[in-house]
């Protein structure tokens, strides 16, 4: 039961995380105008990965897409790439994990195949989450660098009384959405990998040794279960318990083996 719960929860957490990564990537508020001493502004600027926007106090908002590819900073291109790779990997991971879910039956899919798929989707989620966290962090670092640079030249004199106040940008909501979403996807991926260990079939190709005791005879299989990752021999999960005897290891470590018949 615990494996099913871990796998199901991992799937749901990853699903929320990937939805968050998609949302963050599409959001316009990656960087927002720093309002420092001026909490109410007549013109408010904010920027995303795909377009920049201006909101006037009149309520009018105008957004302009970045219609150039070569003219954009390399860092912005890198962030875009990281976020897209994260979304693609996450989407593939979700697709794979749907078929890997224990609660979903697809033909006569073996446990080893489900274990493999669970591990694959888990790794995909981990990489997806890392891509999102990396993308958001790179953008945040770019903002911090630019922030201090523009603070250094905050007021540039233009002769006499004329001043140009430079617009500084600070962290936008999308950065926090991205960090949280990346973290959730990462956690979901780890949960899927943990669930995979519980799903993996055991090696059962031991020879049973018969011990004849006085009274009644019981056939024991010596030794506990050998943990398998599912990448070794493709042993089918068939166990015969004579007399219903079970080892302590089996009961504690692998309760999920008896979740279904």
């Amino acid at each position: 039961m615990a494996v099913t719960a871990c796998q199901g929860l991992g799937f749901v957490v990853s699903l929320i995380g990937i939805a968050g990564i998609i949302a963050a990537t599409c959001m316009d508020q990656w960087s927002t105008q720093d309002l420092y001493n001026n909490p109410v502004t007549a013109v408010f600027n904010y920027q995303g990965l795909w377009r920049s926007c201006v909101r006037e106090s009149s309520g009018f908002t105008e957004c302009r897409g970045y219609f150039t590819l070569l003219g954009l900073p390399a860092m912005l291109q890198a962030v875009r790439a990281l976020m897209i790779v994260g979304i693609v990997l996450g989407a593939i991971g979700l697709l794979v994990s749907i078929f890997a879910l224990k609660c979903i039956r697809i033909g006569s899919m073996e446990d080893s195949a489900k274990a493999n798929m669970t591990l694959t989707s888990g790794i995909m989620f981990i990489v997806s989450g890392l891509c999102a966290i990396a993308g958001v962090s790179v953008f945040a670092n770019m903002l911090v660098t630019n922030f201090w640079m523009s603070t250094a030249n905050m007021y540039t004199g233009m002769g006499g009384m004329v001043q140009t106040v430079q617009t500084r940008y600070t962290f936008g909501a999308a950065l926090f959405v991205g960090w949280v979403a990346g973290g959730l996807t990462l956690i979901g991926g780890v949960m899927m990998c943990i669930a995979c260990r519980g799903l993996a079939p055991e090696e059962t190709n031991y020879k049973a040794v018969s011990y004849h005791a006085s009274g009644h005879s019981v056939a024991y299989k010596p030794g506990g279960f050998k943990a398998s990752t599912g990448f070794g021999s493709n042993t089918k999960n068939k166990k015969i318990y004579d007399g219903g005897a079970r080892t302590e290891d089996e009961v504690q470590s692998y309760p999920s083996k008896h979740d279904y018949v």
């Epitope: 105008q33 001026n38 109410v40 502004t41 007549a42 013109v43 600027n45 904010y46 920027q47 920049s52 926007c53 201006v54 006037e56 106090s57 009149s58 309520g59 009018f60 105008e62 302009r64 233009m158 004329v162 001043q163 140009t164 106040v165 430079q166 617009t167």
Partner: antibody, heavy 118, light 113 residues
Framework: QAYLQQSGAELVRSGASVKMSCKAS????????IHWVKQTPGQGLEWIGY????????NYNQKFKGKATLTADTSSSTAYMQISSLTSEDSAVYFC???????????WGQGTLVTVSA | DIVMIQSPSSLTEKAGEKVSMSCKSS????????????LTWYQQKPGQPPKLLIY???TRESGVPDRFTGSGSGTDFTLTISSVQAEDLAVYYC?????????FGAGTKLELK
């Protein structure tokens, strides 16, 4: 077509307060800021502040904080400005205006003349 | 606060002549986010409220005759009337629409010879 109708001229005593109104029609009142502007022969046009009728948010020119109070009643599509502790310097024409692209004021009321007597 | 300085304070021209008036701001009114200048021009005739002529420094409001042209960027702006008409006699104000508090110039009074 949007239209702003302001209340009539006021003659008030020094030290008293006055409340003028600005009734909006022809547009969704709660969706646009209503700004107030003071005009005197000496000082020209001065921006007092604005109110967003949708949620009652206000933003004042520091010079008029404590002097002017902006309110709005969405049920009657009316904005109000109260000026307290009147002095001769408050004698002016007060306009209400609705904002537009570029934070400009496209629709204006006809103005309310306030005369402060000693 | 941003200070708006208009010049000249008054000017007299013959009908049909081209006229220009200047407006200078103490801070740049150019917004880097959309490359627009937040400067507005108004026309006010005696006994009337101001009338919007131009916003974003050069965008003419609908219904405003095309003889009115706004130009300039940053801190220096100009309103030009290509051929002055009798109905153009008024006071012209420029306004900072970029930073609170919004501020107006003292105005340029246009008179006819």
């Amino acid at each position: 077509q949007a239209y702003l109708q302001q209340s009539g001229a006021e003659l008030v005593r020094s030290g008293a307060s006055v409340k003028m109104s600005c009734k909006a029609s022809g547009y969704t009142f709660s969706s646009h800021n209503i700004h107030w502007v003071k005009q005197t022969p000496g000082q020209g046009l001065e921006w007092i502040g604005y109110i967003y009728p949708g949620n009652g948010d206000t933003n004042y020119n520091q010079k008029f904080k404590g002097k002017a109070t902006l309110t709005a009643d969405t049920s009657s599509s009316t904005a109000y400005m109260q000026i307290s502790s009147l002095t001769s310097e408050d004698s002016a024409v007060y306009f209400c205006a609705r904002d537009y692209y570029g934070n400009s004021f496209v629709y204006w009321g006809q103005g309310t003349l306030v005369t402060v007597s000693a | 606060d941003i200070v708006m300085i208009q010049s000249p304070s008054s000017l007299t021209e013959k009908a049909g002549e081209k006229v220009s008036m200047s407006c200078k701001s103490s801070q740049s009114l150019l917004n880097s986010g959309n490359q627009k200048n937040y400067l507005t021009w108004y026309q006010q005739k005696p006994g009337q409220p101001p009338k919007l002529l131009i916003y974003w420094a050069s965008t003419r409001e609908s219904g405003v005759p095309d003889r009115f042209t706004g130009s300039g960027s940053g801190t220096d702006f100009t309103l030009t009337i290509s051929s002055v008409q009798a109905e153009d006699l008024a006071v012209y104000y420029c306004q900072n629409a970029y930073r609170f508090p919004f501020t107006f110039g003292a105005g340029t009074k246009l008179e006819l010879k």
